[in-house]
Interface confidence: low
């Protein structure tokens, strides 16, 4: 920073403010009796540009011509150097280098709303590096003029604070902006416009929607607008969509009927306004209105499947399952499902409403011909019922699909393939692929999954509710009229060796052989579909290799006889389980000594 210049002066010619590329003359002169004390002719005046020496001279004054100064501020300081003393600061000056303002470009003016004020924006062009004042001038009919000045170095916006009125909407107004700094001035090209050109209406407000007789087909959107609005554009979309539907309307007077809304769908609505067909600009979009359309009765039909289970000689259990309708089919909140069970020969029927579930189980006699019908109901009505005749789905052996296989297909997918049945393959009307987690107890509460496949398909990719390291019982049904045939297989999407072996819970002796019983491995430790069990045994305290017996895995089996043990020899026994990926660790060890007579 610069001191008070008591010892001398620094003068700058032609000015402290110069055009980029100009030359300045800087003169440093000592005031009388301010030189070196004894030897005034030894005065050494030094000129610094910031902290760097650029010139020096012996005497009472120093003159320096400086060129090539950069944009911005440069500080020059003059110092006096005397023999045997520090340099003394004499005086200094700051020189400001800039450019004249460029012509402001793209001047445009807007009035927001009929009651708003006129504001203009422009592009300043390159920075002048000097304080630059902008003056905006607006001239109108009857020699009216308004002027506003901007007091900001980065000024590119000014609001006149005046309101143009629509009394004479075709009257011309002209705006011009002038930039001035100490190096020059420049004016924009004039911008001429009318009231209709620059008034941008306020966005519509108070948007409402009405559904006459609670019907989606009789829907009217209402809103409020400024008085002079001629055009509106409406846009609307389901809340979960990114694409807008767009409608342009003329002279809507704050209402418009919408004819293509979907039932039971939350929509977002917005409206924009304009004063003239081809003059002016659209308003901003209004705030969104979100509204849900009314329900309509469901369309489509439920996908229904069933399972039959034998109970005893006179009764059977029927479990019905169905899939939810899609949102576009449900067209509302499904309140209940209506299940009708009918004995076709006797005409007996029972109807039940099911809420909160997509399955239903009942017990019926094994005699008679039974059919079910299932429909979905919302507040407006019911879907068409899906009707199914209850039959023995696996009764027709000749309809059984052949060579069924199940192979892992990427993450959590299983590809099921089959060959058509031997019986005339053209008789097949559809295939159903069904899968459920394999539970050793044959648990009927395990969720059932299914998909339908066209009669010419011989494969299906199942991915719904498939988890890694879980074994699934997969069935392929071929359906033809009132007959069905089926084949089954076990499959998994991903497998590894089981985490544990079976737990031997009992060893019993029967006529010179033993029967080993075990507990199933918990499902979460099987790690896929089991292929075999192995039973190992060896004499206690023996170092010999154990003998083993490999048993193919069957869901229901949990015991097996061994008849090659010697009497009165103590054996150690254990079991393992195998998947296609490998063998488990040992289960528990049990000792046993056969009591029977030696040969």
């Amino acid at each position: 920073k610069i001191d008070a210049c008591k010892r001398g002066d620094v003068t700058v010619k032609p000015s402290h403010v110069i055009l980029l590329g100009s030359t300045v003359n800087i003169t440093c002169s000592l005031k009388p009796r301010q030189g070196c004390f004894h030897y005034s002719r030894r005065n050494k005046l030094i000129l610094y540009k910031f902290d760097r020496r650029i010139n020096f001279h012996h005497g009472h004054s120093l003159n320096s011509q400086v060129t090539g100064l950069p944009l911005g501020t440069t500080l020059f300081v003059c110092k006096l150097a005397c023999i045997n003393s520090d340099e003394i600061q004499i005086c200094g000056a700051e020189i400001f280098v800039g450019v004249a303002p460029e012509q402001p470009q793209n001047l445009s003016c807007i009035q927001k709303g009929e009651q708003g004020t006129v504001a203009c924006t422009w592009e300043r062009g390159r920075d002048t590096h000097l304080y630059t004042e902008y003056t905006l001038q607006l001239s109108g009919p009857k020699n009216l003029t308004w002027q506003k000045q901007c007091k900001d170095i980065y000024c590119d916006y000014l609001d006149f604070g005046i309101n143009l009125t629509p009394e004479s909407p075709e009257s011309n107004f002209t705006a011009k902006v002038t930039a001035v700094n100490s190096l020059g001035s420049s004016s924009s090209l004039p911008s001429t416009f009318t009231f209709l050109d620059i008034v941008r209406p306020l966005p519509p407000w108070d948007i409402r929607i009405k559904f006459q007789k609670a019907s989606v087909s009789r829907c009217t959107l209402y809103w409020r607008d400024e008085g002079l609005v001629l055009l509106n554009r409406l846009r609307y979309r389901p809340s979960n969509s990114r694409l807008w539907n767009m409608v342009n309307v003329t002279k809507a007077k704050g209402r418009h009927d919408l004819l293509d809304l979907k039932p039971f769908t939350e929509y977002e609505f917005q409206i924009s306004s304009k004063l003239h067909l081809y003059k002016g600009s659209w308003s901003d979009w209004s705030e969104s209105l979100r509204a849900q359309t009314p329900e309509e009765e469901p369309t489509g039909m439920l996908d229904v499947w069933y399972m039959k289970r034998h109970i005893d000689y006179s009764r059977q259990q029927i479990s019905l399952f169905w899939k939810n309708l899609s949102v576009s089919e449900a067209r509302g909140k499904i309140l209940h499902y209506q299940v009708t069970l009918q004995e076709l020969t006797g005409g007996k029927a029972m109807t039940q409403n099911i809420t909160g579930h997509t399955s239903w189980t009942t017990v019926i006699p094994r005699t008679g011909n039974w059919a079910v019908a299932v429909s979905a109901a919302n507040s407006k009505g019911s879907s068409l019922p899906t009707r199914i005749n209850i039959m023995n789905l696996c009764e027709a052996g000749l309809l059984a699909p052949r060579q069924v296989s199940a192979n892992s297909e990427g993450m959590d997918n299983i590809l099921v393939t089959w060959q058509p049945p031997r019986k005339d393959p053209s008789a097949v009307q559809e295939y159903v692929v069904e899968w459920r987690e394999l539970h050793p107890g044959g648990d009927t509460q395990v969720p059932l999954n299914w998909l339908r496949s066209r009669p010419y398909n011989v494969s299906a990719l199942i991915s719904e509710n498939i988890k890694s390291y879980i074994c699934y019982e997969i069935r392929v049904y071929a359906l033809s009229g009132d007959q069905g045939g089926c084949s089954s297989i076990l499959g998994n999407s991903k497998h590894k060796a089981p985490l544990s072996g079976p737990h031997i819970n009992a060893i019993t002796e029967e006529k010179g052989s033993i029967l080993i019983s075990w507990n199933s491995i918990p499902v979460q430790e099987q790690m896929g579909c089991l292929l075999h069990y192995r039973i190992y045994w060896k004499e206690r305290d023996s170092n010999s290799q154990p003998q083993l017996c490999e048993i193919p895995y069957r869901v229901s089996q949990n015991s097996h006889p061994i008849n090659s043990l010697q009497p009165r020899v103590t054996y150690v026994l254990w079991m393992t389980a195998l998947t296609a990926a490998g063998e488990s660790s040992h289960g528990n060890e049990r000792e046993f000594c056969l009591q029977g007579k030696a040969n």
Partner: nanobody, 125 residues
């Protein structure tokens, strides 16, 4: 060395008056502008008023027009801000700032290289 030193502010009742002064030293030419800025917590500095040393031309922000008056005493190198009809919303830290220039303007704070230390003005009953 350019230096700016403000007088102390104070506590004033709504409707009351207060005069702030700014002692200016160190400029080497008359090409300079002195401006008063104010700032409240959480807000940007706002240009209140400014005056040019050479010809005494003045500028006022819309929020203080008709209530505040800026003046200079060239002999004493002082600039004064007379604040009348004070309102609670005038409560702020007031600081004088300076820059070399040829045209007057409220300007943005970043245009001013030289600043005083600031003084608190509180308008409250």
């Amino acid at each position: 060395e350019v230096q700016l030193v403000e007088s102390r502010g104070g506590l004033v009742q709504p409707g009351g008056s207060l005069r702030l002064s700014c002692a200016v030293s160190g400029f080497t030419s008359d090409y300079y502008v002195i401006a008063w800025f104010r700032q409240t917590p959480g807000h940007e500095r706002e240009g209140v008023s400014s005056i040019r040393k050479g010809d005494g031309a003045t500028y006022y922000a819309d929020s203080v027009k008709g209530r505040f008056s800026i003046s200079r005493d060239n002999a004493k190198n002082m600039v004064y801000l007379q604040m009348n009809s004070l309102k609670p919303e005038d409560t702020a830290v007031y600081t004088c700032a300076a820059r070399y220039d040829t045209l007057l303007g409220g300007g943005r704070p970043r245009e001013f290289p030289y600043w005083g230390q600031g003084t608190q003005v509180t308008v409250s009953s």
